[in-house]
Interface confidence: low
């Protein structure tokens, strides 16, 4: 079951998924000037058996027409239900060091992939929050959010992390403001 909405936004914080539950989909997005090959899958799917999880399908991008006007591949309507944008940074991913039953690691990059990764999370997925650079944790509650199914609807649990800068008033829970532009979580996925 796909999660219906995005993980919560926390002021001055970003989230990352360090491993992806089976059933997670990753759109095969290509950078400008490239498109998904016609015979290629529109997404990768985390699948597995009792002992091993891995990504089915491979994303492949090919050069667009000579005029180079093709935009990035647009997900099909069914793919747009849950769009998760994450920054691709380096290949030194935290997920590469994590092994969790029933979860896939961060898929390796593919040639000419887009700079953002769009994930479709499933119920049971956990994402972890960190304060962006220059901000500190003021309140130290659980710093993760889990997509749960409640009364037939999906919802993300509310993380209890509050990040504050030393020179500004403290933010209080529920006070939302435009997210700070982060450097990004240390070599991992970053919310947009």
């Amino acid at each position: 079951e796909l999660c219906d909405d995005d993980p919560p936004k926390i002021t001055h914080a970003t989230f990352k998924a360090v491993a992806y539950k089976e059933g997670t989909m990753l759109n095969c997005e290509c950078k400008r000037g490239f498109r998904r090959i016609k015979s290629g899958s529109p997404y990768m799917l985390c699948t597995g058996n009792s002992s091993h999880s891995s990504w089915d399908n491979q994303c492949q991008c090919t050069s667009s027409a000579a005029r180079n006007t093709t935009k990035q591949v647009t997900p099909q309507p069914e793919e747009q239900k849950e769009r998760k944008t994450t920054e691709m940074q380096s290949q030194m991913q935290l997920a590469d060091q994590v092994s969790l039953p029933g979860h896939c690691r961060e898929p390796p990059p593919w040639e000419n992939e887009a700079t953002e990764r769009i994930y479709h999370f499933v119920v049971g997925q956990t994402v972890y929050y960190q304060c962006v650079q220059g901000y500190r944790a003021l309140h130290r509650g659980p710093a993760e959010s889990v997509c749960k199914m409640t009364h037939g609807k999906t919802r993300w649990t509310q993380p209890q992390l509050i990040c504050t800068g030393e020179t500004e008033p403290s933010q209080f829970p529920g006070e939302e403001e435009p997210q700070a532009s982060p450097d990004g979580l240390p070599e991992s996925e970053t919310s947009r």
Partner: antibody, heavy 117, light 107 residues
Framework: EVQLVESGGGLVQPGGSLRLSCAAS????????MSWVRQTPGKGLELVSF???????SYADSVRGRFTISRDNSKNTLYLQMNSLRAEDTAVYYC???????????WGQGTLVTVSS | DIQMTQSPSSVSASVGDRVTITCRAS??????LAWYQQKPGKAPKLLIF???SLQSGVPSRFSGSGSGTDFTLTISSLQPEDFATYYC?????????FGQGTRLEIK
């Protein structure tokens, strides 16, 4: 007041096992990102393992498959189970709290592990 | 892995001196850098995070600067309690790595 107190270190033969404990007070271990960092005269400070609040764990290449990080929420305690110990694992082991930005804002006093025959 | 190199490895100074310790990262880490102070037989203590932000409770004579690959820890006027070993740490990418340390000794 935040406090971390390690125990369980000692002298062990190569191939042996030890379990280190880190008792926390002043905050809840299960809600935080916790780490074990070791220090040797030769290699300096090295992040050995960490555990995220949701249970995700990670290990340095040098200990993966031999060490296991865990916690007991009811005791508010962090553990490091060390198996198949080698001479190069000899170090002072610290538990440390991550401040949610990969900086370590509180450390225990450390416990010495000596692996020698 | 990102290597962190500190210089000098040791430095001698007197009370009241201004001391500068440098740390270089093998690749750019923006300002994902911390400085720690460690005294013999004690655990490291966080002084500076995010390259230049002072940890709560740390005296203002400590300051940090730099971005990218080159960073500096400055103690504006050395006090007797500042003689210790100082470490830098990058928090940009896993595995998190530390510098080899700079020992600050009394001249």
């Amino acid at each position: 007041e935040v406090q971390l107190v390690e125990s369980g270190g000692g002298l062990v033969q190569p191939g042996g096992s030890l379990r280190l404990s880190c008792a926390a007070s002043g905050f809840t271990v299960s809600s935080n990102y916790m780490s074990w960092v070791r220090q040797t005269p030769g290699k300096g400070l090295e992040l050995v393992s960490f555990i995220y609040s949701g249970g995700i764990t990670s290990y340095a290449d040098s200990v993966r498959g031999r060490f296991t990080i865990s916690r007991d929420n009811s005791k508010n305690t962090l553990y490091l189970q060390m198996n198949s110990l080698r001479a190069e694992d000899t170090a002072v082991y610290y538990c440390a709290r991550d401040d949610y930005s990969n900086y370590f804002d509180y450390w225990g006093q450390g416990t010495l592990v000596t692996v020698s025959s | 892995d990102i290597q962190m190199t500190q210089s000098p490895s040791s430095v001698s100074a007197s009370v009241g001196d201004r001391v500068t310790i440098t740390c270089r990262a093998s690749q750019g880490i923006s300002n994902w850098l911390a400085w720690y102070q460690q005294k013999p037989g004690k655990a490291p203590k966080l002084l500076i995070f995010a390259a230049s932000s002072l940890q709560s409770g740390v005296p203002s004579r400590f300051s940090g600067s730099g971005s990218g690959t080159d960073f500096t820890l400055t103690i504006s006027s050395l006090q007797p309690e500042d003689f210790a070993t100082y470490y830098c740490q990058q928090a940009k990418s896993f595995p998190i790595t530390f510098g080899q340390g700079t020992r600050l000794e009394i001249k």
